[in-house]
């Protein structure tokens, strides 16, 4: 059993999130993940989900009673989602930490917009669409 | 020429982001995008970048002088990044709109954590690594 399971159960107790009523009114993430099978689509969604959890954990960083659980889960996210690649994790963190209200950040973002847009679609990089994208609009 | 280019130039004027000094102290997004060649890695990063732009545009939604430019660019992002797929865009928006300080959202997130974690690595879904991932750790 992966180490995160035990620690996630510990967090469930702390957040009182083990009760069946928590699932009322649908899921946050699971329903959305079920919609997307293509790996690149899943990464688009998981990127937002992982950043949500990192933000949530940051908000509870001073709570010693759950620190071990949080650290173990974050470590497992590093392994699973970032493939143990610190550079990938660091680049991701940089992006999540940019402040949208910082004037210098705003100017830089707009300055880079054209180039960012040019790289957004897979075709821009590969020069061709993948066959799977030709069969059905992903 | 894609329609976003003219509108992005318009935003550059509005944000005073055309000057070369804007590029001082490095880039926000372009340097990071340069690091990642594998499509799924790029989607992880681009997901954060696109959500940044959406947040930025939201902050200026009442400014009539740039509304046409913002709408054109958002539309082009829908085409390029979400492949004109409204469901993909809607699911993405849902994820970006969850409040990390909402107690019900926190409880749901922790309730779903074990299942989310189980799906994080590509191997979990496919049972095998893609050959391109075999060449170099992404």
């Amino acid at each position: 059993q992966d180490p995160y399971v035990k620690e996630a159960e510990n967090l469930k107790k702390y957040f009182n999130a083990g009760h069946s009523d928590v699932a009322d009114n649908g899921t946050l993430f699971l329903g959305i993940l079920k919609n997307w099978k293509e790996e690149s689509d899943r990464k688009i969604m998981q990127s937002q989900i992982v950043s949500f959890y990192f933000k949530l954990f940051k908000n509870f960083k001073d709570d010693q009673s759950i620190q071990k659980s949080v650290e173990t889960i974050k470590e497992d996210m590093n392994v699973k989602f970032f493939n143990s690649n610190k550079k990938k994790r660091d680049d991701f963190e940089k992006l999540t930490n940019y402040s949208v209200t910082d004037l210098n950040v705003q100017r830089k973002a707009i300055h880079e917009l054209i180039q960012v847009m040019a790289e957004l679609s897979p075709a821009a990089k590969t020069g061709k669409r993948k066959r799977s994208q030709m069969l059905f609009r992903g | 020429q894609d329609p976003y280019v003219k509108e992005a130039e318009n935003l550059k004027k509005y944000f005073n982001a055309g000057h070369s000094d804007v590029a001082d102290n490095g880039t926000l997004f372009l340097g990071i995008l340069k690091n990642w060649k594998e499509e799924s890695d790029r989607k992880i990063m681009q997901s954060q970048i696109v959500s940044f732009y959406f947040k930025l545009f939201k902050n200026f939604k009442d400014d009539q002088s740039i509304q046409k430019s913002v709408e054109t660019i958002k539309e082009d992002m829908n085409v390029k990044f979400f492949n004109s797929n409204k469901k993909k865009r809607d699911d993405f928006e849902k994820l970006t709109n969850y409040s990390v300080t909402d107690l019900n959202v926190q409880r749901k997130a922790i309730h779903e954590l074990i299942q989310v974690m189980a799906e994080l690595s590509p191997a979990a879904k496919t049972g095998k690594r893609k050959r391109s991932q075999m060449l170099f750790r992404g």
Partner: antibody, heavy 120, light 111 residues
């Protein structure tokens, strides 16, 4: 100050076993991944194995996979390397190293090494 | 298998600058951090550059690291060469399957 002290090296016959230990101090042991790196006489550095901070993820070089097992006891601040089916080419100085984060990172601090000799 | 290739040796006079290259065999070297370790004879290695271009505390700013995506290589530059810089230098990064990879090492000789 970070201190890493390897022990358990020695002379062993081909096919035999050894267990190396690395006693760590001066940092929060469970928060960092740990690695073993070896250096054959007159040769370069060769990474052997690594383990994440919690011990939940382990990584091995192809040359030792299936023969060596890395483990850690966070309550004792100790890293281990169980080496089975030893070969002459496993002869080397074995270094224990602290990684720079909780998965694979840069090798921030190194021990002085312990020598393993595999010979009949 | 992913490999990192370094020159066997470089030599230069005191006060001069030496650059050691580290070429990746496949993939994109920019997709992982590159580290550089110094090893003096009879001692354990120590990091002089980590995460592409960061210097650990205590390492002089004469040491610098860089990545060149176009040539898929990393470089360690030592400026103002000193006799104490004479050592073996190893670059290190990672391969696809979470294996740590070292270059073969470069012997730096101060003439």
């Amino acid at each position: 100050e970070v201190q890493l002290l390897e022990s358990g090296g020695g002379l062993v016959q081909p096919g035999g076993s050894l267990r190396l230990s690395c006693a760590a101090s001066g940092f929060t042991f469970s928060s960092y991944a740990m690695s073993w790196v070896r250096q054959a006489p007159g040769k370069g550095l060769e990474w052997v194995s690594a383990i994440s901070g919690s011990g939940g993820s382990t990584y091995y070089a192809d040359s030792v996979k299936g023969r060596f097992t890395i483990s850690r006891d966070n309550s004792k601040n100790t890293l281990y390397l169980q080496m089975n089916s030893l070969r002459a080419e496993d002869t080397a100085v074995y270094y224990c190293a602290k990684d720079g984060w909780n998965a694979l990172g840069w090798l921030e601090s190194w021990g002085k090494g312990t020598t393993v000799t595999v010979s009949s | 298998n992913f490999m990192l290739t370094q020159p066997h040796s470089v030599s230069e006079s005191p006060g001069k600058t030496v650059t050691i290259s580290c070429a990746g065999s496949s993939g994109s070297i920019a997709s992982n951090y590159v580290q550089w370790y110094q090893q003096r004879p009879g001692s354990a290695p120590t990091a002089v550059i980590y995460e592409d271009n960061q210097r650990p505390s205590g390492v002089p700013d004469r040491f610098s690291g860089s990545i060149d995506s176009s040539s898929n290589s990393a470089s360690l530059t030592i400026s103002g060469l000193k006799t104490e810089d004479e050592a073996d230098y190893y670059c290190q990064s990672y391969s696809y399957n979470n294996q740590v990879v070292f270059g073969g090492g470069t012997k730096v000789t101060v003439l």
